[in-house]
Amino acid sequence: CKAMHVAQPAVVLASSRGIASFVCEYASPGKATEVRVTVLRQADSQVTEVCAATYMMGNELTFLDDSICTGTSSGNQVNLTIQGLRAMDTGLYICKVELMYPPPYYLGIGNGTQIYVIDPEPCPDSDF
């Protein structure tokens, strides 16, 4: 089989600080040395890119400085963290993995992680 399987958790609950973390694991059909990982958000039928990073196997993921994502890699497993989430960001987050080099190229699409974000209740004014 030449398809690449990507596994990710079905559901994740963001912390009260709007941070959500999940693992994206891929079964590599080849010996990739350069990999691109992209987090996509699917809302209705619209798919948008949340963040992306290309890394060399054995090295750390490097997202752009202004990215809301951070991550670490270990073998065929990527630990992804998305920050700054609010209730309106609740949705399906898909992990996409591309084995860029060496040939052949492989594409892997996860089934998505439903991230639930609950905005914290404002603290009530306290009278002393």
Partner: antibody
Amino acid sequence: EVQLVESGGGLVKPGGSLRLSCAASGFTFSSYTMHWVRQAPGKGLEWVSFISYDGNYKYYADSVKGRFTISRDNAKNSLYLQMNSLRAEDTAVYYCARTSHLGPFDLWGQGTMVTVSS
Amino acid sequence: EIVLTQSPGTLSVSPGERATLSCRASQSVGSSYLAWYQQKPGQAPRLLIYGAFSRATGIPDRFSGSGSGTDFTLTISRLEPEDFAVYYCQQYGSSPWTFGQGTKVEIK
């Protein structure tokens, strides 16, 4: 408007060269991988070449390897295909196509005709 | 290279009838990586179905896709006059990206 527009096709003699261009508009060009696909007269679709987001990774069909070179200029929202050592069998309509975030080719140009004949 | 074989080569159907197109892969293709395109004479291909069964934006629900592994199907439930065209399947899970040879759906 989200679109791709090819140009640069024409009539060329066997052994000659041609450079195709594809102008992208209406979307963030650098966020997508791109392809060239061709279609010989009365025939089916044949994938020709792929280029990654930043242009660092390129793949080619065996039929064009060593003769064609794909490139992109993200600052100009443009994709290119340099075709050298052209053969009669390269005669086709050439399409540029965008890879959607989920993998299929969701946006195509109108195509540009390349005819290789003496 | 994954070879995709489409059948039949030509399908003659009357408007309003159902059309069933087949695409068989030489080796297993993950269902997430199989697409169908429609092409009319003089026009560029148009994405219909991706991920074997998800309809692309703006595609009417009379088009549906199914299948997994090596066998995939595109079904047009009730053919409209504008549906008479050539249909291609494609795998996009690994390089080289490959297309089937196409099925022409013509008016009976």
